[in-house]
Interface confidence: low
Amino acid sequence: FEIALPRESNITVLIKLGTPTLLAKPCYIVISKRHITMLSIKSGERIVFTFSCQSPENHFVIEIQKNIDCMSGPCPFGEVQLQPSTSLLPTLNRTFIWDVKAHKSIGLELQFSIPRLRQIGPGESCPDGVTHSISGRIDATVVRIGTFCSNGTVSRIKMQEGVKMALHLPWFHPRNVSGFSIANRSSIKRLCIIESVFEGEGSATLMSANYPEGFPEDELMTWQFVVPAHLRASVSFLNFNLSNCERKEERVEYYIPGSTTNPEVFKLEDKQPGNMAGNFNLSLQGCDQDAQSPGILRLQFQVLVQHPQNESNKIYVVDLSNERAMSLTIEPRPVKQSRKFVPGCFVCLESRTCSSNLTLTSGSKHKISFLCDDLTRLWMNVEKTISCTDHRYCQRKSYSLQVPSDILHLPVELHDFSWKLLVPKDRLSLVLVPAQKLQQHTHEKPCNTSFSYLVASAIPSQDLYFGSFCPGGSIKQIQVKQNISVTLRTFAPSFQQEASRQGLTVSFIPYFKEEGVFTVTPDTKSKVYLRTPNWDRGLPSLTSVSWNISVPRDQVACLTFFKERSGVVCQTGRAFMIIQEQRTRAEEIFSLDEDVLPKPSFHHHSFWVNISNCSPTSGKQLDLLFSVTLTPRTVDLT
């Protein structure tokens, strides 16, 4: 063999005995008939030698060290060559060492070409025997950054003040390139930065510097993770120790692009974040340790990158191309703000543009997907406007207020679907006819269905809420004077199963002056509870509402009011109630601001209840709750 090292190459080659084996026959390096067990070749030297045995790889190892001085002159940056070429070296287990010394203010970056590196812990070895040992320097102290194999995620390691890189190749390995390059960077102001790139699903186990020994005191180390947006990253700590801190606190910090609370600070014993979408940084910060009893800080952790769990990696088509004047918003449910880190939960359009809120508008087909650990953290709110501008065209026209099935197939819960129903002022009114009769929600008989219809005025200046209504009652239709919003609000995931029970038809009808008319057809033996609109806030001033209550031939209706007095005090005008028999037109009139409310009364025929308000004084509002119960006529009511 002949090894010739160019002058000023700053390369030293050392051939020495490896780990002693139990081989009976010793082996020597032979130079000019001299038998030696160690050979050192320096820059500018040329040495010819042989071995005294057939399998020198069982006895000797070779170390090739190149010192790169960036202190006194320019640094040879770029791709690092294996010098001398492996083809010129004896087939021994070989270690190439590059020792780069630089100023404290200079950042050095090792860039690893594909395959990237995978860090291994103490006692582990690389399957192909190729290992990369990387260390840095703090003043005169050497700090072990880690030992790495091929086929991992580590693409770059940035350090300051100097770096030592040792590449160990087994004697049988054909590799003839270093697989990395060196670049200069501005000061990184920390011990090191390790970049880990995930092309797809996978995991990486990483360790603090000097692991399993202690992380250098009061140092900072950062890992930068590059994760494709369609995948999710979770961090878990496999092993850690805390030192005894005199000043400052040992912690990890996460920097997540787009987060409003960067950096997110965690204790090592906290549950670490999961389900992060896109890139993020993790930093380990040491403290000033107690001089008497320092203890050690060390950390071994795993980053797991995978497709979003459950259904959320699917693409959903939301076809709003045939819809008009409609918008669908997917957004986070309101939650109590906590200082704890919450993993990102995003909805993506075209799998690309992801955000925590997304509004889709009518007229297009949209493809959406989710980047979210728990889709119950999101909900959907939809608004659709149905308006009539020409009363001659709309009159008697009907529209079905039905949630489109495309929306129900999304994996996110529907919260509200609101229909804004707009009519020309003083020209048309509206009637809502449910597929199933409705029950008005009251404290006495609350709705327990998975959804309700909330009916309210849609006139900005008017504060009028007709109430909340759910299927399974006695209200056959609701007529309203002018613009309203009808909101289907869901209360349970079981709405998906009960969706068939929804169904409301709105028709445009000739204009009438009353604010609202409820048509009630009670069922036998069930008690129907009804209350005036704007319950708790009081019926608006000068507003009139009516209930048209049907009584079947063979039944008697009992009308009961739940208070003795209405409690309203009028500033101007009078508040009154009219109860009118529909067949005979006989009516009773009660002054609500003066009289006591009627005792329970019995009605053999259909009747009207009409309530009209005055302008009440503040705090003395008109709120009435009453019930209607049917019983068969054959019962002796005396």
Partner: antibody, heavy 125, light 107 residues
């Protein structure tokens, strides 16, 4: 190494047609959005169209001013992107680039990380 | 379409100087701005996206900043090889649109 090589440019008369090709290599063609962008002489870059990735069924979208005249398509078996240009006008004279929309971080489409060398199209009588 | 305006068509600078190239969008583009460098006779090269994220392999003397409608590309210490045309582009919505370009000249 990612490579994009356009071809098919040349001189064409107004009203004529031309088909540009963009041969790609060094990446999984089906996984990336691909775009066509042009640069008229002395003018700003102008986006023409996008061909979305396999996940998005290779759907296309066009600049409003070119919709109807230009058609973008792919041959996934050969990793080639095409731009069929019809009813060409003098104002279509430009260097035509194909580019990969490759920055796959969240919130960032239409970010062109690799471009071809361009192919010159001249529309003149 | 969103209009991207680069007010300076030319900028003259010296090697080692710090230079800032600006770009204004006709509406809020929510940090969805990319910067490209185009050297004579070459195709554009991506430098920055998402307003401030440096693309792989781009020297760290190039930095991007800005939000809303105003964005800036800064070269901290201009090198001779930085002589080129610089374009901004919004990637906020379709169609993506480019600025008219700023030509960086070395004095």
């Amino acid at each position: 190494e990612v490579k994009l090589v356009e071809s098919g440019g040349g001189l064409v008369q107004p009203g004529g047609s031309l088909r540009l090709s963009c041969a790609t290599s060094g990446f999984t063609f089906s996984d990336f959005y691909m775009e066509w962008v042009r640069q008229p002489p002395g003018k700003r870059l102008e986006w023409i169209a996008v061909s979305r990735d396999k996940t998005n069924d290779y759907t296309t979208e066009y600049s409003a001013s070119m919709k109807g005249r230009f058609i973008v398509s792919r041959d996934t078996s050969q990793s080639i992107l095409y731009l069929q240009m019809n009813a060409l006008r003098a104002e279509d004279t430009a260097i035509y680039y194909c580019a990969r929309d490759g920055v796959y971080y969240y919130g960032s489409s239409y970010t062109l990380d690799y471009w071809g060398q361009g192919t010159s199209v001249t529309v003149s009588s | 379409d969103i209009v991207m305006t680069q007010s300076h068509k030319f900028m003259s600078t010296s090697v080692g100087d710090r230079v800032s190239i600006t770009c204004k969008a006709s509406q809020d583009v929510s940090s969805s701005v990319a910067w490209y460098q185009q050297k004579p006779g070459q195709s554009p090269k991506l430098l920055i996206y998402w307003a401030s994220t440096r693309h792989t392999g781009v020297p760290d003397r190039f930095t991007g900043s800005g939000s809303g409608t105003d964005y800036t590309l800064t070269i901290s210490s201009v090198q001779a090889e930085d002589l080129a045309l610089y374009y901004c582009q919004q990637h906020y919505n379709t169609p993506p649109t480019f600025g008219g370009g700023t030509k960086l000249e070395i004095k």
